[in-house]
Interface confidence: low
Amino acid sequence: SAPGEDEECGRVRDFVAKLANNTHQHVFDDLRGSVSLSWVGDSTGVILVLTTFHVPLVIMTFGQSKLYRSEDYGKNFKDITDLINNTFIRTEFGMAIGPENSGKVVLTAEVSGGSRGGRIFRSSDFAKNFVQTDLPFHPLTQMMYSPQNSDYLLALSTENGLWVSKNFGGKWEEIHKAVCLAKWGSDNTIFFTTYANGSCKADLGALELWRTSDLGKSFKTIGVKIYSFGLGGRFLFASVMADKDTTRRIHVSTDQGDTWSMAQLPSVGQEQFYSILAANDDMVFMHVDEPGDTGFGTIFTSDDRGIVYSKSLDRHLYTTTGGETDFTNVTSLRGVYITSVLSEDNSIQTMITFDQGGRWTHLRKPENSECDATAKNKNECSLHIHASYSISQKLNVPMAPLSEPNAVGIVIAHGSVGDAISVMVPDVYISDDGGYSWTKMLEGPHYYTILDSGGIIVAIEHSSRPINVIKFSTDEGQCWQTYTFTRDPIYFTGLASEPGARSMNISIWGFTESFLTSQWVSYTIDFKDILERNCEEKDYTIWLAHSTDPEDYEDGCILGYKEQFLRLRKSSVCQNGRDYVVTKQPSICLCSLEDFLCDFGYYRPENDSKCVEQPELKGHDLEFCLYGREEHLTTNGYRKIPGDKCQGGVNPVREVKDLKKKCTSNFLSPEKQNSKSN
């Protein structure tokens, strides 16, 4: 039988009446155009909805937008368009919501062609009031908030000027011209690239990387011959043109660009690219594109300095620069990532790592599933997950994989069971242990979301026909109840719940269509009465993450430590609540060779945990350029994996001697560094 339909599924008592009392409809007085929705702050219940409608005239497009505000998680909305003087808001800039709980919102308005600059509407009270401000420039990008101070904003203008505001957009100052890309770093630092000659495109590979730590009073050139740059975790990366040819190399800095080291990664040619797939304060996953239009490359994982890299995964699917990759961080369990590889026969297969890229394997076949037509052996196959690439290929996949840090172990995704991803209609699968085991959760494609830190999962069938039914589960997707939320079906466009999965409210968005008009409509359902009591100690059970062999004392050890969690029992129907904090208990493991990556000049042969010297470097002194000094490395081939906390056990010795000799890459020599003041 289909999941959730067997006899042992207990029904939630009187749920229809409870949900009916907590279902709130709001019909928007709008012609259907586009709608965008933003949450303002955390746990505030404030939602802003911007609807825009374009009327195409023969020569130009006339636009109209409306702004609505809710302060009860979407149950009721108020039209606040008059607060922004009924101005048409540019949807391509979206609504710029301030970091944390600052309550700040910036809307960018459409202005007539001849105006001197753009116009913004600013609010610092969770959109209760707005102030109109005319800008001395036309913005090219959305306003970017400093992560450290929400009063500091930066924006690029259509004329490539870098503009900064120190008073939340009230007053603006152009701090630099000829800027291609600008990003906030830590401590209110701004990094940006500039061109000297023609334009950003013409100077690609000859750009300079600059830094200002005082919002434009003074500047320091920290890189030349730059192609592009990126920030990830505590690392600053720059791809830099080589002297002799058109290849580029990655350089990395961990001190905001004061000193640089060349990353031990392959160089790339004109048609290739680098991409930071994921980064934290410990390490980085880097994709390096293969030469030619292959659609794949190699994933490398870094050491703690971002300099020494280990090959993690070959034939990693990643189509062209800025294209699609299925690389997904499973946020519900430490160390877990999922992605796709392009196999020799051009089929796409899903791979998973449980140890931050150390080893990749196929996903285990779900117990309750048959192998499909892609499988050579009907008894042996794997689960393959649909993610960004499938969505870009217009397969019948409405959503990417979903996981939430506070819903420990839960991963939900569309997939197919076979030897490779299938183009057939997918089903929805769930894992409750961070990707080790999977179960078919729902037949056919669905939209899904997690509420109350995993206490409730909500799903809506993906259909071209109007819908009026929502499904929900209180036991991590084992059993499902269906609820008819309206008599009149709507054309469904999306599910919205507050980011962070702590809420118990879900909003169903769609439109109604009659003979003459169509209107936006939302239904907000509050599940608080389904989970009628607060969870108590007895509702939780101890769960050891990454457990594969309970008989082994080191069971669950990943990156040198194991973690036990208190998790809600599947049979408990109760509220984790908005203040729920994941309870976990770490314990340190003994070190083994698995806790070390191979150092510079060493590699791991396949299926071997020992690091051996690279043949071409055998007998040579290992000397390399680090922070602008030549270093001599004495090593037996191992370096602890970033973030690994193991103690005792094996302990390979490693020593780096400073040769006190200056060395530079072609990238940036200390003499070239210069500082300027405005």
Epitope: D552, Y553, E554
Partner: antibody, heavy 124, light 107 residues
């Protein structure tokens, strides 16, 4: 019942090696750490290191690194501790002890079952 | 290495007395502390694990408390068979280290 039985007393000359055995019974030998602790006459307890029989993974105290080797033979549920280049201050009672397994939350490496001890005397 | 300091190093008490032994770690060890009892010529015996959990088979007059750096072993009513040496042991960070011991003697 769970017990650890150690080999008999040894008298060794300085510079020699000694190998003490510890036979386990009454539980799944492979799944529990086996720790080694020694006690010099009139002194306190000193941790030397341990081995996890399931994978043979070892952990040694820095003080004994290079001189101690811990091994196991899972087929006969026996752990061994060999100490080389013996000195007179290695004279002690050597104990093997089973690492306590946590029931739920990790509870630290306690030692819940001990061998009777093996007296090693190093004297010229 | 983490140093474990026990105090007192010895004490005299009578049957029925309440006895308290303290153990201090040179850095925080969370609650990863165990207490052992050792009688002359015998192997140590685990009394308390994880700072406050009583090992099965150990009389309830033994109790442990503390976390971080300061820990206590309490014998609520000393019995004749309790005269022995008591050791604390941390297992938070490798290497495992023991306290110097507290000898409980008959007054």
């Amino acid at each position: 019942q769970v017990q650890l039985v150690q080999s008999g007393a040894e008298v060794k000359k300085p510079g020699a090696s000694v190998k003490v055995s510890c036979k386990a019974s009454g539980y799944t030998f492979a799944s529990y750490y086996m720790w080694w602790v020694r006690q010099a006459p009139g002194q306190g307890l000193e941790w030397m290191g341990g081995i996890l029989p399931s994978g043979g993974r070892t952990s040694y105290a820095q003080k004994f690194q290079g001189r101690v080797t811990m091994t196991r033979d899972t087929s006969i549920s026996t752990a061994y501790m060999e100490l080389s280049r013996l000195r007179s201050d290695d004279t002690a009672v050597y104990y093997c002890a089973r690492g306590k397994r946590s029931s739920g939350w990790y509870e630290g490496y306690g030692m819940d079952v001990w061998g009777q001890g093996t007296t090693v005397t190093v004297s010229s | 290495d983490i140093q474990m300091t026990q105090s007192p190093s010895s004490l005299s008490a009578s049957v029925g007395d309440r006895v308290t032994i303290t153990c201090r770690a040179s850095q925080s060890i969370s609650s990863y502390l165990n207490w052992y009892q050792q009688k002359p010529g015998k192997a140590p015996k685990l009394l308390i694990y994880a700072a406050s959990s009583l090992q099965s088979g150990v009389p309830s007059r033994f109790s442990g408390s503390g976390s971080g750096t300061d820990f206590t072993l309490t014998i609520s009513s000393l019995q004749p068979e309790d005269f022995a040496t008591y050791y604390c042991q941390q297992s938070d960070v490798s290497p495992i280290t023991f306290g110097g011991g507290t000898k409980v003697e008959i007054k």
